[in-house]
Amino acid sequence: VAQVSITKCSSDMNGYCLHGQCIYLVDMSQNYCRCEVGYTGVRCEHFFLTVHQPLSKEYV
């Protein structure tokens, strides 16, 4: 298994991840956003709400 060198993003990237933590993937030369629960997108810019709906009468 290849090891990935990671560190925190530089101050230069402040504000890059809108709803998440910015991680610098050193060997891949890129920043990565680890999104908070409920957010998605490259920069955690999209909010998604998972709605659990009860089964309709047809399925009962």
Epitope: D12, G15, Y16, V42, E45
Partner: antibody, heavy 116, light 106 residues
């Protein structure tokens, strides 16, 4: 394949403005920051500023504040750098540079010549 | 603003020589430094980022080191194709380039 394609060379008179475009393909500029760097003939590299295309936030070097405007049009995946009140010292190659999802991916450069 | 002082501004060395370029930051830049190579008429080429991480395809004779405010870029054995100008770039807080070092063959 990711690309940043810049507009062609420009010749401007002192006091005029120039607007250089930087069209991205292969990626969404909203996922990145777009930086602008310039290089005068025989001189070093000079960082001018950047934009966050997702929200339009900009940061400029104090030296250029008030004279440079960086914008982005996410519908066309294009960033722009406008420099006003041009003088001969602004003759340079202007580069757009993508950062964020990939470290510093450069456009081919646009030569702006300021001459009376 | 962070200032980057790069030295020397130019150097002349023989093929096979070890070449060292330094950049000193006006404050701690936490290893967020990159090194570029630029040949005449070309856009800069990224060689190293995060102080010492070599980019894919970059020969192993290029290396970087340092921490805090002091950083070094080394070519272990200068080759004719290494003739270029080299720049450091800090990206800890916004961005600042060093003044460049022109490398020539003796």
């Amino acid at each position: 394949q990711d690309q940043l394609v810049q507009s062609g060379a420009e010749v401007k008179k002192p006091g005029a403005s120039v607007k250089v475009s930087c069209k991205a393909s292969g990626f969404n500029i909203k996922d990145t920051y777009i930086q602008w760097v310039r290089q005068a003939p025989g001189q070093g590299l000079e960082w001018m500023g950047r934009i966050d295309p997702l929200n339009g936030n900009t940061k400029y070097v104090p030296k250029f504040e008030g004279r440079v405007t960086i914008t982005a049009d996410t519908s066309t995946n294009t960033a722009y750098m406008e420099l006003s009140s041009l003088r001969s010292e602004d003759t340079a190659v202007y580069y757009c540079v993508r950062s964020g999802t990939l470290f510093d991916f450069w456009g081919q450069g646009t030569l702006v010549t300021v001459s009376s | 603003d962070i200032q980057m002082t790069q030295s020397p501004s130019s150097l002349s060395a023989s093929v096979g020589d070890r070449v060292t370029i330094t950049c000193k930051a006006s404050q701690d830049i936490h290893k967020y430094i990159a090194w570029y190579q630029q040949k005449p008429g070309q856009a800069p080429r990224l060689l190293i980022q995060y102080t010492s991480t070599l980019q894919p395809g970059v020969p192993s004779r290029f290396s970087g080191s340092g921490s805090g405010t002091d950083y070094t870029f080394t070519i272990s054995s200068l080759q004719p194709e290494d003739i270029a100008t080299y720049y450091c770039l800090q990206y800890d807080n916004l961005r600042t380039f060093g003044g460049g070092t022109k490398v020539e063959i003796k």
